[in-house]
Amino acid sequence: KFSKQSWGLENEALIVRCPRQGKPSYTVDWYYSQTNKSIPTQERNRVFASGQLLKFLPAAVADSGIYTCIVRSPTFNRTGYANVTIYKKQSDCNVPDYLMYSTVSGSEKNSKIYCPTIDLYNWTAPLEWFKNCQALQGSRYRAHKSFLVIDNVMTEDAGDYTCKFIHNENGANYSVTATRSFTVKDEQGFSLFPVIGAPAQNEIKEVEIGKNANLTCSACFGKGTQFLAAVLWQLNGTKITDFGEPRIQQEEGQNQSFSNGLACLDMVLRIADVKEEDLLLQYDCLALNLHGLRRHTVRLSRKNPIDHHS
């Protein structure tokens, strides 16, 4: 149930995340399942555990196997399994199916190819992109952050795309490659009246004065590429940019996250150094498209101060 497949190539870095949810303050213990041997946390080891992450720097074929992670949260220990397979490097250009990440589809309007698993690594731009082993060149291809954008997508753009980047760990560099297929399709979607998944209507969000707080506005708009769809936050009915409080900023999440084929958008409202006056504001999560506008209101309430009595 809580098992995740991970794979990589020998002599490349591989970082695997525990498939169970954790928190920064909760320790995570990692074990090699076959022997129940604990994975060390010291970074001098080639394979070591670092909280939620298990790092192979670099990976070896012999590292293949099942690894157990246990999130030591209070009340319940959450156990997960990482099924790791390390393959020998292929001498030819062909990328076998077992090394491929999920296929992504694009259209003329939407042609982003995300580099799989890159968020687990400490990398710096630019990414290198290859199609069928050839380095991509030309103005139609733009490597932007962790994804590749292809302008004026054509059916000939379908194929296997490999991203290559360098992971840095304590000054040492390790190469990582990841490949996924890209297919081009005619967009046949539909749009619906926006559905806000979070926050709940009239939700009360508890915050601590002086700490940072995040509110996520998440909504879905239909299937396929949306002609017009937006999520945004308002404060007391005013756009964030017009409100003029530099401590409160909104930040776009992943542009279109297709879960269950739905086109969804996220917008995170970040409040730095929460102040008493922030509790008096009305926070509106707005989702709009051609069908109309939906609004969910959130208010902040003071998380009770941590009074220590001894």
Epitope: K1, F2, R20, Q21, K23, P24, S25, Y26, T27, R72, S73, P74, T75, F76, R78, A198, P199, A200, N202, E203, I204, E206, E208, K211, K303, I306, D307, H308, H309, S310
Partner: antibody, heavy 123, light 111 residues
Framework: EVQLVESGGGLVQPGGSLRLSCAAS????????MHWVRQATGKGLEWVSS???????YYSGSVKGRFTISRENARNSLYLQMNSLRAGDTAVYYC?????????????????WGQGTTVTVSS | NIVMTQTPLSLSVTPGQPASISCKSS???????????LFWYLQKPGQPPQLLIY???NRFSGVPDRFSGSGSGTDFTLKISRVEAEDVGVYYC????????FGPGTKVEIK
């Protein structure tokens, strides 16, 4: 307003079944672990079962194999399917909210409780 | 299983006077994250329990400052500095380090 409302309690014969429901509102249900706690008349509180945000389930020894906890995040609902009921299961059953996994900060224990629903097992 | 014990099991207090309830756990409630998972609840007659104190000594929102919690490891105390009529009910300590266990409860009544 943060609220939990239980339903589904009633009178049932030993060996019978009941399904309790808990409707949550006013908070993002999917990010919280949820729990059932019961209290027999004039007695103390007893933890019964829990379900975490990822669907993993936990049971006290006295109900393991007979009770099944589940959740439906899309409906903001928590359930407790109770089979092979015994007289000793007679109690008020409370639905209660636990840890918020969207908040890296403090854990408030069981901070929100419903009013409870009464289950009576008797022939 | 962690066992929780409370003393006294009942307490009769004059309004305005202090009250103290002790709670002991069969093992330390200190977690590897540095926090201690001990909570205090008040259950008023005919009502569900309500959270008073979390993490040994932190008052939950809306809880009057006459309530205070202290202790560490396995020994904990809830104090009411000046008992009021509305404080009657059963007080429970609870651990959530390993699953959940409640103490047997302390019934507080007004003299």
């Amino acid at each position: 307003e943060v609220q939990l409302v239980e339903s589904g309690g009633g009178l049932v014969q030993p060996g019978g079944s009941l399904r309790l429901s808990c409707a949550a509102s006013g908070f993002t249900f999917s990010t919280f672990d949820m729990h059932w706690v019961r209290q027999a008349t004039g007695k103390g509180l007893e933890w019964v079962s829990s379900i975490d945000t990822e669907g993993d389930t936990y049971y006290s020894g006295s109900v393991k194999g007979r009770f099944t906890i589940s959740r439906e995040n899309a409906r903001n609902s928590l359930y407790l399917q109770m089979n092979s009921l015994r007289a000793g299961d007679t109690a008020v059953y409370y639905c209660t909210r636990g840890e918020d996994w969207s908040d890296d900060d403090y854990y408030y224990g069981l901070d929100v409780w419903g009013q409870g629903t009464t289950v009576t097992v008797s022939s | 299983n962690i066992v929780m014990t409370q003393t006294p099991l009942s307490l009769s207090v004059t309004p305005g006077q202090p009250a103290s309830i002790s709670c002991k756990s069969s093992q330390s409630l200190l977690h590897s994250d540095g926090k201690t998972y001990l909570f205090w609840y008040l259950q008023k007659p005919g009502q569900p329990p309500q959270l008073l104190i979390y993490g040994v000594s932190n008052r939950f929102s809306g809880v009057p400052d006459r309530f205070s919690g202290s202790g560490s490891g396995t020994d904990f105390t809830l104090k009411i500095s000046r008992v009021e009529a509305e404080d009657v009910g059963v007080y429970y300590c609870m651990q959530s380090l390993q699953l959940f266990t409640f103490g047997p409860g302390t019934k507080v009544e007004i003299k």
